[in-house]
């Protein structure tokens, strides 16, 4: 999606939220995958009627992708060859390297609650010892 963006650094951390912040974010938790393979990062916001206006996917302090309610998906140029949108509000990481090991955050921007943040830890393994739920693995 053709966006004009001067820089891509973003914030992480856990969300604050509004005075009636009731929602919770469910994530895939700690997951592992094989080098060269693919993985789906998934978050789900529940227990709130807040309107989701945007979801940001971040790796530590780097913005990977945005899913905006109006404008749809935008993938940061530095990741466009290895990151694919979806399924849903999730994010697919492809051609994994050991350097992809680390924390990933889904940040839900909502109204009126504010921001909700989910954390996923991905470990990329050299060999075929990676084990995780099939629903998050892409063969």
């Amino acid at each position: 999606y053709p966006y004009d963006v001067p820089d891509y650094a973003g914030g992480g951390g856990s969300g604050g939220g509004g005075s009636m912040m009731t929602g919770t974010i469910e994530t895939t938790g700690n997951i592992s995958a094989e080098k060269g393979g693919s993985i789906i990062l998934q978050c789900h916001l529940s227990s709130t009627t807040a309107q989701v206006t945007q979801v940001n996917w971040e790796q530590q302090d780097q913005l990977l992708a945005i899913c905006n309610a109006d404008a749809g998906w935008h993938i940061s140029p530095s990741f466009k060859d290895r990151v694919a949108p979806g399924p849903g509000l999730g994010l697919t990481l492809q051609s994994l390297t050991v350097n992809d090991t680390g924390e990933y955050f889904c940040i839900y921007h909502t109204y009126p609650d504010g921001t909700y943040t989910g954390r996923i830890f991905l470990e990329v393994l050299e060999s075929s010892v990676a084990e995780h739920g099939a629903r998050f693995q892409i063969p």
Epitope: Y1, G16, A69, D113, T115
Partner: antibody, heavy 119, light 107 residues
């Protein structure tokens, strides 16, 4: 170069109406959420309203809710603020500002347009 | 609404000084705080967002820190062009709210 230019300010009597415009250039306007922020003479900044890139999300400060209407025309690269039932306390410089793509703050601001509400 | 309290409201400093401005939120806003600089008769300029991320083109003498409710803007070595008013603003939830401002004046 990103540019935001406000217009439409002026002197209006209490209870009157004004329509502010903000002309955007130098970026793909239809991709960005936009804000109006105001500043009363000698005072601090006050957020007024927000509209998302496709107008599906619109939020207002309680102080203007029901009186002000934010809108945009992406084909014209323009943002608007229709102000009705104006009060003396609405006197301020009104700025339009662009929301960062990542939704983290306002990265470009116009020069502002002065609105004076007085009899 | 989240209340943002800045301190001090004004300060006098000299070129080369290290200047620190604090901002406190009435409830946790995680890292979602921005800092703006405004000069008389001009529009605000974004310096820092998400607590500590420097906006593109802003000199590295500006830095931000903090999370939760307490945040700090630091100017490591004050330059002549830095004399201005600084505002903090939470961008965690609507309505977005600003601090009252800190005016940095020449000593």
């Amino acid at each position: 170069e990103v540019q935001l230019v406000e217009s439409g300010g002026g002197l209006v009597q209490p209870g009157g109406s004004l329509r502010l415009s903000c002309a955007a250039s130098g970026f793909t306007f239809s991709n960005f959420g936009m804000h109006w922020v105001r500043q009363a003479p000698g005072k601090g900044l006050e957020w007024v309203a927000f509209i998302s890139s496709g107008s599906s999300s619109i939020y207002y400060a309680d102080t203007v809710k029901g009186r002000f209407t934010i809108s945009r025309d992406n084909a014209k690269n323009s943002l608007y603020l229709q102000m009705n039932s104006l009060r003396a306390e609405d006197t301020a410089v009104y700025y339009c500002a662009r929301m960062r793509l990542d939704y983290y703050a306002m990265d470009y601001w116009g020069q502002g347009t002065m609105v004076t509400v007085s009899s | 609404d989240i209340q943002m309290t800045q301190s001090p409201s004004s300060l006098s400093a000299s070129v080369g000084d290290r200047v620190t401005i604090t901002c406190r939120a009435s409830k946790s806003i995680s890292k979602y705080l921005a800092w703006y600089q405004q000069k008389p008769g001009k529009a605000p300029k974004l310096l820092i967002y998400s607590g500590s991320t420097l906006q593109s083109g802003v000199p590295s003498r500006f830095s931000g820190s903090g999370s939760g409710t307490d945040f700090t803007l630091t100017i490591s070595s004050l330059q002549p062009e830095d004399f201005a008013t600084y505002y903090c603003q939470q961008h965690n939830e609507y309505p977005w709210t600003f601090g009252g401002g800190t005016k940095v004046e020449i000593k």
